[in-house]
């Protein structure tokens, strides 16, 4: 069983009258309809909700929204709603927030129906005020803020137009008409897709790929025969159909779509698809669906230049109706990724790389827990984690599996002990080495969070019936204990607290039900108190990431290098502190043959670490061969793993083939390129 | 089988500084924190420090904060312990100890492995 | 820091008696707690570490138990190579021993 309030876990002391006197309720004066909460800039407080709620009439809706402002982390709120004259506001857009610390909030209104335009209202100042403005058109999707540049806003209209406003959304020119899609790429450049015919639906497969690098002065054509487009990392992916036929394959480029190259991935046909599940400046995970209805596919890992590719998991689990995938990356411990494999028996099972997908194991049985009845053998067997797809299967999930960059290690999920994932009410697993092992932390399904870097963790029981504990731990989920925040219990509708894991306040929200009304209520809990002093030096022990043999000289070494992290005594009650860094000490690894990938014509015979030339080039290879720039067709048979920062030791040095002499051009060759000017 | 060898017994005057060796054979010393222990004649055993090898990460009771250095040499696989201004309360038994692991963290399975011990007479 | 007390300080048994030695901490260090033998003249030797898990080559005839500031070394039925000085360790903030428990022959 879970540990829980015994007299073996280390009591927090008067924490009953600590909490009580740091816990804030707040009652919104407005009928129950629907909630959202967003939190503006990062250590500023600021939380905007807008509540919205549909009175139906004859013959139409009616919608009315307010809107409130926190500047306490959500001890207190302001109804602002004059601000934005009590305009109904659109939640399918939410609340477009601004990029770091801009203090840049927009919202979009409801307008009657014969308007030439939509209407937004802008807040440059954190919410104290809004600029109301009338749209030259009507938008049908949310404000997109360039990654660099705040006051520069992207927009689709209803009609395929493609809007940019320079100055904050006060003015807005339609730079392009006849658009599918449009993203923001780096430099404040536009990448986006147009038709030539119909529509976006009609042309799929022939649309062109436009960029412009000046906010619509200039525009340049970077791909034709697109079906759709993706930036990932440092990467620009598009998915191009072939010439002769229905098939479709990824083409990568690296320079903003100057130039492009053939990725050696399997084509797709017209009921497949492509997913990047992850991707950043060093490597890529494609997914890359299979043919029929199989619900499952392969993932792939890329080289550094997104071009040649390894197999990382067969039968990944990627359903083609809801679109669900539970690939999760742990972003509290470098290299660590969790999904879900379909096995031949139907059954769905929980895999995890601590390698950047070099390989998959299953996750180990926690040491607390016995197998379920979906073990064979009751003495072996694996924890399975509840994702995105269990949720989607109305499972008993609350929530997805949460880690948090700054709580080294921690990974809080449920899941399920057996030989694969249980329709049974699952309980909620913690790790505290980013998911090495494993330890049963609540019994029964909760929402949970973590606050100030890992220091506490917050969980609430997920119940139909109406709540008013909440349960915390000091000690990584080890003990727990339970304080109620209210005598008249809530129905509970979720949990908020601040972005990134640093702040001390969590937020209850939920709803009170009597016989005639139906109310919002709040509850802000801050946890300074019981925290009580900074964390000094002593606090801090050190910990070595992905150890798993201290014998072996190179334990720890993962992509090439070992890393220690100062983490907090679960003992030690104390502060990390909103300015917490986590500390680490990095020290390169000495190289083996498992630091390098097999470039392309090459391949790893099973149980064997030394890359082989392929006897002859088939399937996508060939294709590859045939299409693939020239030089990426000559190698000596190894390439580094993207990221792995490995030294001497192991350097594979052998004679360099050339594989060109079969080449020709590919499909986005230069000449298909064009360039125009507004 | 992991060995640790400290160097020989040591005679001092008060106000001078000592520094003992701790040579480890037979295992992968910069995987393991070494850990220094004194013991007083007659007395229980008392932590002083420790040190990880690799990063020379190294962190020490209050009590000899800035009168112990402890350092490590990964190229000879050799652990020290420093101590200045030495006083007669520091006539001890030290001993030099490999901190077992079985996880990531450093400190937390107990000392596995133990020096032979160096004597240290602190006498004027 | 946090004081680690070992109780009782000295404890005469004779040999095929069962032993119990306690230690307390002065807050919770979880399970992270080990025990030591040590003989005169020489160095400490690991019985149990994180609490409860026997140390290897280690007689079956100790045990630790306990999680939090309470734990117990057992010695189920002591034999006469167990006449020795026994320590507790916590490794959960800075490392400290306790005080010690000498075991004699009544």
């Known amino acids: 069983s879970a540990p829980g309030e015994d007299e073996e876990c280390g009591r927090v002391r008067d924490f009953v009258a600590k909490l009580a006197n740091n816990t804030h309720q707040h009652v919104f004066d407005d009928a129950r309809g629907s909630v959202s909460l967003s939190w503006v800039g990062d250590s500023t407080g600021v939380i905007l909700v807008l509540t919205t709620f549909h009175v139906p009439l004859v013959i139409m809706t009616f919608g009315q929204s307010k809107l409130y402002r926190s500047e306490d982390y959500g001890k207190n709120f302001k109804d602002i709603t004059d601000l934005i004259n009590n305009t109904f506001i659109r939640t399918e857009f939410g609340m477009a927030i601004g990029p770091e610390n801009s203090g840049k909030v927009v919202l979009t209104a409801e307008v009657s129906g014969g308007s030439r335009g939509g209407r937004i209202f802008r807040s440059s100042d954190f919410a104290k005020n809004f600029v109301q403005t009338d749209l030259p058109f009507h938008p049908l999707t949310q404000m997109m803020y360039s990654p660099q540049n705040s006051d520069y806003l992207l927009a689709l209209s209803t009609e395929n137009g493609l809007w940019v406003s320079k100055n904050f959304g006060g003015k807005w020119e339609e730079i392009h008409k006849a658009v599918c899609l449009a993203k923001w790429g780096s430099d404040n450049t536009i990448f986006f897709t147009t038709y030539a015919n119909g529509s976006c639906k009609a042309d799929l497969g022939a649309l062109e790929l436009w960029r412009t690098s000046d906010l619509g002065k200039s525009f340049k054509t970077i791909g034709v025969k697109i079906y759709s487009f993706g930036l990932g990392g440092r990467f620009l992916f598009a998915s191009v159909m072939a010439d002769k036929d229905t098939t479709r394959r990824i083409h990568v480029s690296t320079d903003q779509g100057d130039t492009w190259s053939m990725a050696q991935l399997p084509s797709v046909g017209q009921e497949q698809f492509y997913s990047i599940l992850a991707a950043n400046d060093d490597m890529v995970f494609m997914h890359v669906d299979e043919p029929g209805d199989t619900g499952f596919g392969t993932i792939f890992t890329s080289d550094d230049r997104g071009i040649v590719y390894s197999k990382s998991l067969d039968r990944h689990l990627y359903t083609t109706t809801g679109g669900e995938t539970d690939f999760t990356n742990v972003t509290s411990l470098r290299g660590v990724y969790i999904t879900s494999v379909l096995s031949e028996d139907n059954s769905i099972q929980t895999m995890i790389t601590f390698d950047q997908g070099g390989r998959w194991t299953h996750l180990r049985k926690p040491e607390n827990s016995e197998c379920d009845a979906t073990a064979k053998n009751k003495n072996e067997c694996s924890l399975h984690i509840h994702a995105s797809y269990s949720i989607s299967q109305k499972l008993n999930v609350p929530m997805a599996p949460l880690s948090e960059p700054n709580a080294v290690g921690i990974v809080i999920a449920h899941g399920s002990v057996g030989d694969a994932i249980s329709v049974m009410v699952p309980d909620v697993y913690i790790s505290d080495d980013g998911g090495y092992s494993w330890t049963k932390m609540l019994e029964g399904p909760h929402y949970y969070t973590i606050l100030d870097s890992g220091g506490i963790i917050v969980a609430i029981e997920h119940s139909s019936r109406p709540i008013n504990v909440i349960k915390f731990s000091t000690d990584e989920g080890q003990c727990w204990q339970t304080y109620t925040f209210t005598r008249d219990p809530i129905y509970f509708t979720g949990l908020a607290s601040e972005p990134g894991a640093r702040s001390m306040n969590i937020s209850i929200w939920g709803f009170t039900e009597s016989f005639l009304t139906s109310q919002w209520v709040s509850y802000t809990i801050d946890f300074k108190d019981i925290l009580e002093r900074n964390c000094e030096e002593k606090d801090y022990t050190i910990w070595l990431a992905h150890s798993t043999d201290p014998e072996d000289y190179e334990d720890g070494c993962i992509l090439g290098y070992k890393e220690q992290f100062l983490r907090l005594r679960k003992s030690s009650v104390c502060q990390n502190g909103r300015d917490y860094v986590v500390t680490k000490q990095p020290s390169i690894c000495l190289c083996s043959l498992e630091d390098f990938l097999c470039d392309f014509g090459y391949y790893r015979p099973e149980n064997d670490s030394k890359c082989v030339e392929q006897p002859e080039l088939k399937g996508h290879d060939l294709e590859f061969c045939l299409y693939g720039r020239e030089e990426h067709l000559t190698t000596n048979g190894y390439r580094k793993i993207p990221g792995d920062k490995c030294q001497g030791g192991v350097n594979p040095v052998r004679e360099v083939k050339d594989l060109k002499k079969k080449c020709t051009s590919n499909f986005l060759s230069p000449e298909k390129q064009n360039s125009k000017s507004n | 089988q992991v060995q640790l060898v400290q160097s020989g017994a040591e005679v001092k005057k008060p106000g001078s500084s000592v520094k003992v060796s701790c040579k480890a054979s037979g295992g992968t010393f910069r995987n393991y924190a070494i850990s220094w222990v004194r013991q007083a004649p007659g007395q229980g055993l008392e932590w002083m420090g420790g040190?990880?090898?690799?990063?020379?990460?190294?962190n020490y009771a209050q009590k000899f904060q800035g009168r112990v250095t402890i350092t490590a040499d990964e190229s000879t696989s050799t652990a020290y312990m420093e101590l200045s201004s030495l006083r007669s309360e520091d006539t001890a038994v030290y001993y030099c100890?490999?901190?077992?692991?079985?996880?990531?963290?450093?400190?937390?399975?107990?000392?596995?492995?133990w020096g032979q011990g160096t004597t240290v007479t602190v006498s004027s | 820091d946090i004081q680690m007390t070992q109780s009782p300080s000295t404890l005469s048994a004779s040999v095929g008696d069962r032993v119990t030695i306690t230690c307390r901490a002065s807050?919770?260090?979880?399970?992270?707690l080990a025990w030591y033998q040590q003989k005169p003249g020489k160095a400490p030797k690991l019985l149990i570490y994180?609490?409860?898990s026997l140390e290897s080559g280690v007689p079956s005839r100790f045990s630790g138990s306990g999680s939090g500031t309470e734990f117990t070394l057992t010695i189920s039925s002591l034999q006469p190579d167990d006449f020795a000085t026994y320590y507790c360790q916590q490794a959960d903030g800075h490392i400290t021993f306790g005080g010690g428990t000498k075991v004699e022959i009544k």
């Open positions: 807050q919770s260090i979880s399970s992270w």
């Open positions: 100890a490999r901190q077992g692991r079985k996880t990531g963290y450093y400190y937390y399975y107990g000392m596995d492995v």
């Open positions: 994180k609490a409860s």
């Open positions: 040190i990880i090898p690799i990063g020379g990460w190294a």
